[in-house]
């Protein structure tokens, strides 16, 4: 970068190299140079000349004022006119940044998905910082007091295998940068109380042509858990609003839900499970669509395929899992 | 590393009881189930019990009134003790751990070397 | 208790060959099943977990399915080492209980 050129001479930001985003600041250019009295000391932003607010100080040094300066990086280097140099004679080169404080991290969730291994714990980080913002997550056995800390720029996966303290920790999470620190509330959690099950998934539909047509959604999850509630909604794809039906689910087989509903209309159904009585939600899956027929049976009909329908005694979908849901707010 | 090292009599006279201690490492039993399987000499795996994490044991039917299973989880150890032995209980050992965040209910994902146990007079 | 039928309990094959096992179960027990791998003297090393799922470090040669109470186990690319023992095992209630086994000879 800039910082690595030779110098001869210096540059310094007041009040720092990071600072506050909109702050005023002033980058001081101080020359250096053998046989040279600057005759004039230009400053560059991103390579670009600056023509205003700069000051000539002294005969070696000149200063350069921003107003409200928002730019997250900047190069900046500076440069000396020379007598008898036909080329103007670099001086010094600095990396500004600026940026925000972090903000207080809320909303720490510490879930464990079911078959993966690992402990994920994520926060709300606030605003966007736009330095380099670290996280410190604190992880403190309620059992032994032993406390482990995990040093992240995002979210955090930390082996089950690493926490030896028992099935009880506090977990909270530190957010630093050259702008300041702030800490997030103390989460409690019991290791068994947020297993999210293994996904589940919808592999297939098919309308039963009966004296009132039904709808049978066929779905499963690979999940070893015993206790298992779920939730499945659904709406036509013209629709805002969602319909949700709850199960009680044993997953040693592949569930069966049937729905009554309106024919000639393009639905769309999703699931969701969490074990029993646990805080935390699966994402819900990805979008399943399914149309019924008409009531009235017609001659054409359809290839089989993610989105199809047909005219015989039953209509079937197969999912393709190409799209996936606004999982939004799931976990909470 | 994760390791479990079961550590055993070898001989035990007919009627007598076999005590194996199961030793872990780089795991916390308070955290994980530890199953307990045999294999008798040319046969195949039988399951005889476990104890969870939180301390409750479940055994096999045929084995409720002679088998006892417990641990120390401060020590790192896990106890297996069979009374009334006889010569069909001649087998090999196992101390296992289940990973349940890992590989869901009752996976066996680490085993020990085993203990070779010759019930004989 | 839950009874799983191993078959073959024995196969012979050649080097780069693919077989399958495969593993029945007296009721239905989801995709609670998992394979293991036993070499002579040794302890049995985990493989296929949740029925379909490969273990951390498993080749890809190996690989699972089914679900319900028909399951199966294939070794896509026989390589000399996996010539040994394969057992099934459900994890779906208590007692746990393993398959016959199947020994994998090579031709």
């Known amino acids: 970068g800039i910082t690595n050129i030779n110098c001869s001479g210096h540059i310094w930001v007041e009040p720092a190299t990071i600072f506050k985003m909109g702050m005023n600041i002033s980058i001081y250019c101080q020359a250096a140079i053998k046989n040279c009295q600057p005759r004039k000391l230009h400053f560059y932003k991103n390579g670009i000349k600056e023509r205003f607010q700069i000051t000539r100080i002294n005969k070696t040094t000149a200063r350069l004022w921003y107003k409200n300066f928002l730019e997250p990086h900047a190069s900046m280097y500076c440069t000396a006119e020379c007598p008898k140099h036909f080329q103007e004679t670099l001086i010094c080169g600095k990396d500004i940044s600026s940026g925000y404080p972090p903000d207080i991290p809320d909303e720490v969730t510490c879930v464990i998905y079911e078959y993966s291994g690992n402990m994920t714990c994520t926060w709300n980080a606030g605003k966007l910082t736009y330095i380099d913002t670290k996280y410190v997550v604190h992880v403190k056995s309620l059992e032994t007091e032993e406390e482990q800390q995990y040093l992240t720029s995002s979210y955090i996966n930390i082996s089950t295998d690493s926490l030896q303290g028992g099935k009880k920790y506090l977990v909270w999470v530190q957010a630093a940068n050259a702008l300041g620190m702030e800490e997030s509330k103390q989460l409690q959690i019991h290791l068994d109380d947020i297993v999210i099950p293994s996904a589940a998934v919808i592999s297939r539909a098919e309308t039963i042509n009966a004296t009132v047509p039904k709808t049978i959604i066929y779905w499963d999850s690979q999940t070893t858990i015993e206790k298992v509630s779920c939730e499945m909604r659904y709406k036509a794809t013209t629709n805002q609003t969602w319909n949700v039906k709850e199960f009680d689910t044993n997953f040693t087989y592949v569930q069966q839900s049937e729905f009554y509903l309106e024919p000639n209309i393009k639905y769309v159904f999703q699931v969701r499970c969490q074990e029993t009585g646990k805080r935390y939600w699966q994402p819900w899956s990805s979008l399943f669509f399914h149309k019924t027929p008409e009531t009235v049976p017609q001659v054409t009909s359809k290839a089989f395929q993610h989105d199809t329908w047909n005219s015989g005694l039953t209509v079937a979908s197969i999912s393709t899992g190409h799209l996936t849901s606004d999982n939004r707010g799931d976990i909470g | 590393q994760v390791q479990l090292k079961e550590s055993g009599p070898g001989l035990v006279a007919p009627s007598q009881s076999l005590s194996i201690t199961c030793t872990v490492s780089g795991f916390s039993l308070t955290n994980y189930d530890i199953h307990w399987v045999r294999q008798s000499p040319g046969k195949g795996l039988e399951w005889l019990g476990v104890i969870w994490s939180d301390g409750r044991t479940d055994y096999k039917g045929a084995f409720i009134s002679r088998l006892s299973i417990s641990k120390d989880n401060s020590k790192s150890q896990v106890f297996f003790k069979m009374n009334s032995l006889q010569a069909d209980d001649t087998a090999i050992y196992y101390c296992?751990?289940?990973?349940?965040?890992?590989?869901?209910?009752?996976?066996?994902?680490?085993w020990g070397q085993g203990t070779s146990v010759t019930v004989s007079s | 208790d839950i009874v799983l039928t191993q078959s073959p309990a024995s196969q012979s094959a050649s080097l780069g060959e693919s077989v399958t096992i495969t593993c029945l179960a007296s009721?239905?027990?989801?995709?609670?099943l998992a394979w293991y791998q036993q070499k002579p003297g040794k302890s049995p090393q985990l493989l296929i977990y949740a029925a379909t799922r490969l273990a951390d470090g498993v080749p890809s040669r190996f690989s699972g399915s089914g679900s319900g109470t028909k399951f199966s186990f294939k070794i896509s690319s026989l390589q000399a080492e996996d010539f040994v023992f394969y057992y099934c095992?459900?994890?779906?209630?208590?007692?746990?209980?393993f398959g016959g086994g199947t020994k994998l000879e090579m031709k």
């Open positions: 095992h459900q994890l779906y209630s208590i007692p746990l209980t």
């Open positions: 296992a751990r289940n990973n349940y965040y890992r590989y869901g209910r009752n996976t066996m994902d680490y």
């Open positions: 009721q239905t027990i989801g995709s609670w």
